[in-house]
């Protein structure tokens, strides 16, 4: 027999890792292998997630917690809890329905996942291109062309010193 110390709903006494077994007078039965219950008072145990194929096990299942998966090398996780694995591409590429394709001119991707994004338009910020963009790297914006004209100084002159007790004019 099984003893629990509860005067209320007997199922409320069933801790994580067990389930309230209605088929057996509501005793707290341990979760069978390959199943778990992460909270107390559960009437069933959930089947452990299996990390198969392109998924690999990051954390093993236990009687109280589900397995956690990540992706095998060459793939990366997508979705909540790594519900999908997506193929990696090289930097300078994006994944399309036809596989990995190089970024078009004017776009870049500095990661193995995600899409190619347009280079930054330096002129929108009134700046000039300091370093050209590539498929793998964004452009580097530098000072505006006006800042680089002859005689112009990029150093801001210091503010004039003020004597104590005088307010600015």
């Amino acid at each position: 027999f099984e003893r629990t110390r509860s005067l209320q709903d007997p199922c409320s006494n069933c801790p994580a890792g067990t389930f309230c077994d209605n088929n057996r007078n509501q005793i707290c039965s341990p979760c069978p292998p390959n199943s778990f219950s992460s909270a107390g008072g559960q009437r069933t145990c959930d089947i452990c997630r299996q990390c198969k194929g392109v998924f690999r096990t990051r954390k093993e299942c236990s009687s109280t917690s589900n397995a956690e998966c990540d992706c095998t090398p060459g793939f990366h996780c997508l979705g909540a809890g790594c519900s999908m694995c997506e193929q990696d591409c090289k930097q300078g590429q994006e994944l399309t329905k036809k596989g990995c394709k190089d970024c078009c001119f004017g776009t870049f991707n500095d990661q193995k996942r995600g899409i190619c994004r347009p280079w930054t338009n330096c002129s929108l910020d009134g700046k000039s291109v300091l370093v050209n963009g590539t498929k793998e790297r964004d452009v580097v914006c530098g000072p505006s062309p006006a800042d680089l004209s002859p005689g112009a100084s990029s150093v801001t002159p210091p503010a004039p010193a003020r004597e104590p007790g005088h307010s600015p004019q």
Epitope: T18, R24, N25, P32
Partner: antibody
Framework: EVQLVESGGGLVQPGGSLRLSCAAS?????????PCWVRQAPGKGLEWIGC?????????YDAQWTKGRFTISRDNSKNTVYLQMNSLRAEDTAVYYC?????????????WGQGTLVTVSS | IQMTQSPSSLSASVGDRVTITCQAS??????LAWYQQKPGKAPKLLIY???TLASGVPSRFSGSGSGTDFTLTISSLQPEDFATYYC???????????FGTGTKVTVL
């Protein structure tokens, strides 16, 4: 080293009481590892006594034949499980084993102590 | 739950195929373990979940069955396999963890 070590066995008179201890080392009892007691009378088979939930709850699973004479308890701070045996009879003479029932092994006993002999005799 | 093993004893020779059966008094799904015990030693887990080999157990041991009828097979008996074998229900609660009566395997 992962092991279970029983202690507390010995000679006891009929009607007497005894408390056996089982100290775990190298792992902790948890919801994945339940401590259990099994006994074996001389020349006889294995007999399941009971188990206790390995976490912080006091749920016990006992063989009906124990009829409340045997009680399993646990001290998580010491990682030790106990078997309190009362109203002992000659037929309780046996080697008493502590075992670990593991979720990872289908709740089979994947780790056993060396056993401690209890002799009930006047 | 009562667990009945048969035979209670058997004699065999090295290299023989040995089969031991275990019957549960009610369905226990696949929640069955098999143990080997040698004189003066604690039992050793061989198989769990009816058919899964425990770590370090030689592949000549195998288990099968589900529900109420289970079998332990030793495909080619080795000298170190002469021992007593027990089945155990691992179906917790209501006397769910009972052991079988045991099968002693001796040299022919």
């Amino acid at each position: 080293e992962v092991q279970l070590v029983e202690s507390g066995g010995g000679l006891v008179q009929p009607g007497g009481s005894l408390r056996l201890s089982c100290a775990a080392s190298g792992f902790s009892f948890s919801a994945n590892y339940y401590p259990c007691w099994v006994r074996q009378a001389p020349g006889k088979g294995l007999e399941w006594i009971g188990c206790i939930y390995g976490g912080s709850s006091d749920i016990t699973y006992d063989a009906q034949w124990t009829k409340g004479r045997f009680t399993i308890s646990r001290d998580n701070s010491k990682n030790t499980v106990y078997l309190q045996m009362n109203s002992l009879r000659a037929e309780d003479t046996a080697v008493y084993y502590c075992a670990r029932s593991a979720w990872y092994s289908g709740w089979g006993g994947d780790l056993w102590g060396q056993g401690t002999l209890v002799t009930v005799s006047s | 739950i009562q667990m009945t093993q048969s035979p209670s004893s058997l004699s065999a020779s090295v290299g023989d195929r040995v089969t031991i059966t275990c019957q549960a008094s009610q369905s226990i799904s696949n929640r069955l373990a098999w143990y080997q015990q040698k004189p003066g030693k604690a039992p050793k887990l061989l198989i769990y979940s009816a058919s899964t080999l425990a770590s370090g157990v030689p592949s000549r041991f195998s288990g099968s069955g589900s529900g109420t009828d289970f079998t332990l097979t030793i495909s080619s008996l080795q000298p170190e396999d002469f021992a007593t074998y027990y089945c155990q229900s691992t179906y917790y609660g209501n006397d769910g963890n009972a052991f079988g009566t045991g099968t002693k395997v001796t040299v022919l």
